[in-house]
């Protein structure tokens, strides 16, 4: 797959592949003079024809050198509870982070976990009673395994396998926005924003001070957390005297729409509360903070707008890469579209298609994006994150192209380099019209379904859709049948 072609090597210009093949280096060697440059993926156009044998050689060389590596062989990230115990999870236990250092690398990946939110006493109590790991650090395991973009295996993470990896567990239930401690008046602390700040402060003493790039990434509520906190992290580092650390964001599955629900429902609990209602209530309950420049655009009491990607994005200073399924399951959940394996009604089907259109529209002016036409939720820490493609480009490849756009030789131009795109939004109109989407299974039999089966299963009427698309039903069926799945995930 595309994503496999990003083994890293030092050097400012993409070199012509020399014999013997260059190796992925665990320790990035300091260049002789001045600042070390950011590690730079190879340009493999010259060996494109014989890629498989080239990669096999590289892999076998890499494996034989692996034992000599400065890295520990242990893949786990290790838990560190915050030394500043006043920065806490909901229940007052100290927040923390999991870290796996990569001594030779000046790249740091800080990942914000997702896990929805709660926005009043009742649903926070319920969350504390059934999902305590998302509100307390008391039972966190001592280690975690890095997966997807947090993996240190080049096969699983062709993008940044050599980076320093940090996983920040979500235990504040506030979409990473809060800054209020537990008190006699407040049963729970909501300190998501402060947790990020404190983790960054503590990491400065563990090598982050020498970083070239800090990528603040997150999925779901963590993805929204990236949008809300990326500029504040950059400001913090500047204030603390580290202005040369480039702060960037990667927001996965956190770009929500404040749209009208398919069926209006009362805001009783997290699942069926409309996006705007939940955030309006939440921001008050959490004493939520939003980016300063966004806050200035909305009058007092309207800060909730800044939780929605398409409204906050234009106000951000840091570059942000947006990853978003066009048919995000969490978006559909809060919009009261519950796909339970039963055929959907025509109204639901049109609503789903319209959601894809609206979402595509909001990404039009987002410079760096990856938006496949799939029904799913979250991707970057899934081990199959390398498999999905948009317009023939995988996500790790798109991230690599985005990385390259920050190099000096390309600074002047904001347009992507030829053959290295990073604005990738599917244009086909319904869920799973992209054949590389994660596999969908029949909820009752467990059987894998191809696109045609999935759409039929949802009550999709070929005749009607062919008419909508202005094409022959037979042509549409042919297109769908070619969309068989080759990936085995979920």
């Amino acid at each position: 797959s595309e994503g496999r072609k990003t083994w890293r090597r030092r050097g400012q210009q993409p070199p012509q592949p020399p014999p013997p093949p260059p190796l992925p280096q665990r320790a990035e060697v300091e260049p002789g003079a001045g600042q070390p440059v950011e590690s730079f993926p190879l340009d493999f156009t010259a060996v494109e024809g014989n890629m498989d044998s080239f990669m096999a050689q590289v892999k076998s060389l890499a494996q034989s050198l692996y034992p000599c590596s400065a890295q520990q062989l242990n893949e786990d990230l290790r838990l560190h509870l915050l030394l500043n115990t006043s920065v806490t999870c909901n229940d007052g236990s100290p927040a923390g982070y999991y870290l796996k250092e990569s001594k030779g690398s000046r790249r740091w990946l800080l990942f914000l976990e997702g896990g929805w939110y709660c926005f009043n006493r009742e649903n926070c109590d319920s969350r504390y009673s059934t999902m305590r790991r998302l509100m307390s650090s008391k039972d966190w395991p001592h280690t975690r395994t890095g997966t997807g973009i947090l993996s240190s295996q080049p096969e699983e993470n062709p993008h940044w396998w050599n980076a320093n990896m940090v996983f920040i567990p979500y235990c504040s239930s506030d979409v990473w926005s809060g800054a209020s401690p537990k008190s006699d008046k407040n049963e729970y602390a909501f300190m998501g924003s402060l947790i990020i700040q404190e983790v960054v402060r503590e990491l400065l003493g563990k090598g982050l001070s020498g970083a070239k790039v800090l990528l603040l990434a997150g999925s779901s509520a963590g993805g929204t957390g990236v949008l809300l906190n990326v500029d504040r992290v950059a400001e913090l580092l500047e204030e603390l005297g580290y202005p040369s650390i480039q702060v960037r964001g990667l927001a996965d599955s956190g770009w929500f729409l404040d749209n009208k629900q398919y069926r209006r429902s009362d805001c009783i609990d997290t699942i069926n509360c409309a996006p705007t209602d939940a955030i309006r209530r939440g921001i008050r309950y959490w004493s939520g903070m939003v980016p300063e420049r966004c806050q200035r655009q909305f009058k007092e009491g309207e800060e909730w707008n800044c939780f929605f990607g398409y409204k906050v994005y234009p106000t951000l200073r840091c570059p942000v890469f947006v990853v978003q399924w066009l048919f995000d399951e969490a978006q559909l959940t809060v919009d009261n579209v519950h796909l339970t394996g039963q055929p959907v009604q025509e109204g639901q089907w049109l609503y789903i298609q319209n959601l894809g259109r609206e979402l595509r529209g909001t990404l039009k002016d987002v410079q760096a994006s990856f938006a496949p036409a799939c029904l799913s939720h979250e991707i970057i820490i899934r081990s199959y994150w390398t498999d999905v493609q948009v317009k023939g480009t995988s996500l790790p490849r798109a991230l690599h192209c985005w990385d390259r756009s920050f190099h000096d030789s390309h600074k002047a131009s904001k347009t992507p380099m030829k053959g290295c795109p990073f604005h990738l939004v599917d244009s086909c109109p319904w869920p799973h019209c992209n054949p590389s989407c994660p596999t969908i299974r029949d909820q009752f039999t467990g059987q894998e379904m191809n696109v045609a089966q999935f759409l039929m299963h949802m009550g999709f009427d070929v005749q009607t859709v062919a008419q909508q698309q202005g094409m022959e039903p037979s042509k549409l069926l042919g297109m769908l049948s070619n969309g068989n799945h080759h990936h085995h995930h979920h």
Epitope: S126, Y128, S129, T130, M131, L339
Partner: antibody
Amino acid sequence: DVQLVESGGGLVQPGGSRKLSCAASGFTFSSFGMHWVRQAPEKGLEWVAYITSGSGAIYYADTVRGRFTISRDTPKNTLFLQMTSLRSEDTAMYYCARSADGLDYWGQGTSVTVSS
Amino acid sequence: DIQMTQSPASLYVSVGETVTITCRASENIYSNLAWYQQKQGKSPQLLVYGATNLADGVPSRFSGSGSGTQYSLKINSLKSEDFGSYYCQHFWGTPFTFGSGTKLEIK
């Protein structure tokens, strides 16, 4: 050590009532959600009712809503299930369970038989 | 309400084998899933919570995986004490439905 001990089971006539109790010890009772789960003879587990920590919000399965009432007496560390209008299909072993992440501690169960 | 479809209903296996039990939710439950073991005449015991986290004291031969609607419990090199019934349960909005159970029996 965490302990949950149910009591109050027995034979009840259809249409009759029964109150089950669950005595908790070894943990801070008010800090945990508490559930009732039942299991009919030779059948699987069925979730019945739940009361959250803190505010004590209450939730029921559709099969018992309107007939069963869950409550807790925090000072006495006791959970209750008041069952009314009992039917033969309510015959089961009733377990109380504590929750934080999943139902992490269960009592030994108390058996309720609804029969004439 | 969310339905949990558990399979298989029963499994005949030998000590030392590896087994996988699956649970499918009728909609995304965002990893809010627990697995339990119940031995004949005993109360259930929590094995896994949050889809992948092992409960205290559970041997490492047990592991949970999955996301979205698809979840599984894997038991490596079965021991004689692992035989019994296994249930999944979701915690994504009430009712907190259980799967119908999988009975693990000695071959």
